[in-house]
Interface confidence: low
């Protein structure tokens, strides 16, 4: 099938980085500056994405692949292919229509993005609160009160909280 197709359609021989130029007897012409074709057989090249303003270039455009953008410091990507940049907030805050607001009591956010989430309710699992929650950190649940009776083994200390800036995105 591929051989038949290439015999019928000379454009199928044009590799990525070129386009099939109808104005020049369908020869394969390289994509002009600031454009690309990521697959073979294309009749036009696509214009390279421009990473402007709050976007910055993560990977420059080449003749075969589009530019990739990320966000300038203080912002993070949202959407497929980083289609939007959203303002960062501090840990312990969430972004609202009026800007960054501190998490309400009983909620936390350990990242620079996303919303404040309620502290874990330790009692639902029959456990007690070992370390109180803050705006930036969830509570740490410990053994149930019954487990802390005299003679019970000591509690393993909780793992250290993640360092700011190293929370998963």
């Amino acid at each position: 099938f591929e051989r038949t197709r290439s015999l019928q359609d000379p454009c199928s021989n044009c590799p990525a980085g070129t386009f099939c130029d109808n104005n020049r007897n369908q020869i394969c012409s390289p994509c002009p500056p600031n454009s690309f074709s990521s697959a073979g057989g294309q009749r036009t090249c696509d214009i390279c994405r421009q990473c402007k303003g709050v976007f910055r270039t993560r990977k420059e455009c080449s003749s075969t692949s589009n530019a990739e953008c990320d966000c300038t410091p203080g912002f993070h990507c949202l959407g497929a292919g980083c289609s939007m940049c959203e303002q960062d907030c501090k840990q312990g805050q969430e972004l609202t229509k009026k800007g960054c607001k501190d998490c309400c009591f009983g909620t936390f956010n350990d990242q620079k993005r996303g919303i404040c989430r309620p502290w874990t309710n330790c009692s639902l699992d029959g456990k007690s609160v070992l370390v109180n929650g803050t705006k930036e950190r969830d509570v740490v649940c410990g053994p149930s009160p019954a487990d802390l009776s005299p003679g019970a083994s000591s509690v393993t200390p909780p793992a250290p909280a993640r360092e700011p800036g190293h929370s998963p995105q």
Epitope: A16, T18, C28, S29, P33, C48, Q50, E60
Partner: antibody
Framework: EVQLQQSGTVLARPGASVKMSCKAS????????MHWVKQRPGQGLEWIGV????????SYNQKFKGKAKLTAVTSASTAYMELSSLTNEDSAVYYC??????????WGQGTTLTVSS | NIVMTQSPKSMSMSVGERVTLSCKAS??????VSWYQQKPEQSPKLLIY???NRYTGVPDRFTGSGSATDFTLTISSVQPEDLADYHC?????????FGSGTKLEIK
Amino acid sequence: EVQLQQSGTVLARPGASVKMSCKASGYSFTSNWMHWVKQRPGQGLEWIGVIYPGNSDTSYNQKFKGKAKLTAVTSASTAYMELSSLTNEDSAVYYCTRGITTAPEYWGQGTTLTVSS
Amino acid sequence: NIVMTQSPKSMSMSVGERVTLSCKASENVGIYVSWYQQKPEQSPKLLIYGASNRYTGVPDRFTGSGSATDFTLTISSVQPEDLADYHCGHTYNYPFTFGSGTKLEIK
């Protein structure tokens, strides 16, 4: 690592022709533009033209049409520029430079051409 | 052809000073302007492409800005190793053209 290795210094007589080379390594030679740029002593840069080695498509600065001819041998990953009917005005350093679509990126070390009788 | 005009032709600055180089295009070239640094007896090196994108490995004291016809290269705190010629050029269409360069000298 991308490298562009250009041929050495050339001394030529007025009216003669010269052909300089630019050997590429470290990337796909056939799918990247190769530009040629002229720089006369103490002056700015002048874009001569560009070749796409994948199909030898070229585009020239009108000023250099008939003066420069760009070719490429893909099996040797080498681009060539031939300059004809040389005059003193052609005395310069000539650079080959690989282009990303938004800028000439990697530059060769340059070939110095001196035209003198 | 699009004409790229650089100013000043040359400048002499002290270490630590802020340097601003200008490049004007004779017509709208969008963001398709690049800046190159050329040290004595060396090939040009790409500093900035797409008007404001710092090329890999370029120190962050170099910043490009502008669009359409007016472009600027700023060196926030000039260092002795910044002694060089600086060229701007457009890649908006063929033929690419360059400015005549700005020579930066260090006092």
